[in-house]
Interface confidence: low
Amino acid sequence: SGVFQLQLQEFINERGVLASGRPCEPGCRTFFRVCLKHFQAVVSPGPCTFGTVSTPVLGTNSFAVRDDSSGGGRNPLQLPFNFTWPGTFSLIIEAWHAPGDDLRPEALPPDALISKIAIQGSLAVGQNWLLDEQTSTLTRLRYSYRVICSDNYYGDNCSRLCKKRNDHFGHYVCQPDGNLSCLPGWTGEYCQQPICLSGCHEQNGYCSKPAECLCRPGWQGRLCNECIPHNGCRHGTCSTPWQCTCDEGWGGLFCDQDLNYCTHHSPCKNGATCSNSGQRSYTCTCRPGYTGVDCELELSECDSNPCRNGGSCKDQEDGYHCLCPPGYYGLHCEHSTLSCADSPCFNGGSCRERNQGANYACECPPNFTGSNCEKKVDRCTSNPCANGGQCLNRGPSRMCRCRPGFTGTYCELHVSDCARNPCAHGGTCHDLENGLMCTCPAGFSGRRCEVRTSIDACASSPCFNRATCYTDLSTDTFVCNCPYGFVGSRCEFPVGLPPSFPW
């Protein structure tokens, strides 16, 4: 099922005459009859097998036809059909003159015909209008036409019936070819099968509407991929429904018997090691300094006499402390103190005893420092070099490596950047704090006046009489190309008329 649409656009009958050549009085009040029929190699009279339609009077002699309803008629004209579009057709368009208001064929004189056109060909279903223009000796008709499918009909021949729906029998819209296009969330031949929540377990879950995941017995979770253990399972899991597989450290039918008291209750104190020894039983192995079933009691750490070499032990909140006799040091008074006899001074330092030999002091040679003369003196630590100079240690002395533009022992003297005459082509050099600047003469540019800038000698429009000006870049001068009839370096002089020739 579909509609053949004909859009009349313009009719030209400049002389206002009928097909017979006789003029209309007072003008040709024109209406149209349209006949649509099956394809004929030669279009001949006979039944309009695909339909017929007439218009009201649309205008007089020559006129354009509006795209909307006009005088009760419609434009485009509609020729509906309720069969498969065959892809070919014949079309007859007759223009008639209406002397009065009665447009019925039997009410018109036979010579009221203004023009008649007949075309035939192939025409595919589609939205695009096909434009045509038919001209006779007296008239011209411009029109366009197309075939479109009726609502709910699709395909190349408008033969596929498809009506969109969203109910128990299907959830779809129709594609241009009439095939079903499922609404989001539906699938299947007639789009009746919902698409479950993404990831919903294929066997353990199902859905009755899109994006849903309903669990079958024994399964739970958003995607129905978690089994349900049997009722009362305390510390266990399942791999299939109604199981109770115990977690580590638990036992019994309901996994409620504690086999790992150490892990679940941490009974041992003060860093002791816990060992399981049966259901709800354990043993604590205490760290030194602690005792009791749970190692909760603290022993005095001085009981083990930790201080050596006659040191005396004092208990403290976080342990103990040894008070060492003279000549000993260390956590347990295990080390004896140094004296000059132990040669403690490095790099040629000399040792001096103090406090009757109980301790000593080192006197260091030049370039070394530290309590044992172990450190070399760095003469660059004071940053003596100015203006970003780099300090270098050179044996007992130091030197400064200066940045460009500076000199002197400590890079304190500024060298003039202009001393090298860096500006080309007579440019003037200016010393600046961070370098130099060149002021360039006319015709030159760049940081060092190294770029030759061409002067546009044509800028002042030196050529007369519409001559074309060219700049000579090598000499910065101009050349004028004179039009016919003028000479001179600026084309300023008119040439005299050429002499007349004797022939």
């Epitope: 795209d67 070919t88 060909g121 192939s122 695009n128 209008w129 096909l130 045509d132």
Partner: nanobody, 125 residues
Framework: EVQLVESGGGLVQAGGSLRLSCVAS????????MGWFRQAPGKEREFVSS????????NYTDSVKGRFTISKDNAKNMVYLQMNSLKPEDTAVYYC??????????????????WGQGTQVTVSS
């Protein structure tokens, strides 16, 4: 023949806008209508929108109605596609197309179709 060159594609975030342009050259006096098609990876080329060169109206596919607007400039032989409220599913190569009228033959009318090279539109989420 009509030559078509598209421009204006690019990368844009979802909800953003792009304006595609297509310039026609060659036998432009024969153009009947112009429009846009698109082709996403692994999918067939699909119609997006068209505009009648003589000013007789526009067409849009349902998924872009209210978001895309097609327009033309006959003097410049240009057609434009203003794309607003872009979605990730609008990601595709967009092709300009022109139908040229239309030759009458003994078997009916024949319509010619010309394609551009395409411009990539990518909408990120």
């Amino acid at each position: 023949e009509v030559q078509l060159v598209e421009s204006g594609g690019g990368l844009v975030q979802a909800g953003g806008s792009l304006r595609l342009s297509c310039v026609a050259s060659g036998d432009t006096s024969e153009i009947y209508d112009m429009g846009w098609f698109r082709q996403a990876p692994g999918k067939e080329r699909e119609f997006v929108s068209s505009i009648h060169w003589g000013g007789r109206g526009t067409n849009y596919t349902d998924s872009v109605k209210g978001r895309f607007t097609i327009s033309k400039d006959n003097a410049k032989n240009m057609v434009y596609l203003q794309m607003n409220s872009l979605k990730p599913e609008d990601t595709a190569v967009y092709y300009c197309a022109a139908t040229r009228l239309i030759v009458y033959t003994p078997t009916g009318f024949r319509q010619y179709f010309d394609w551009g090279q395409g411009t990539q539109v990518t909408v990120s989420s």
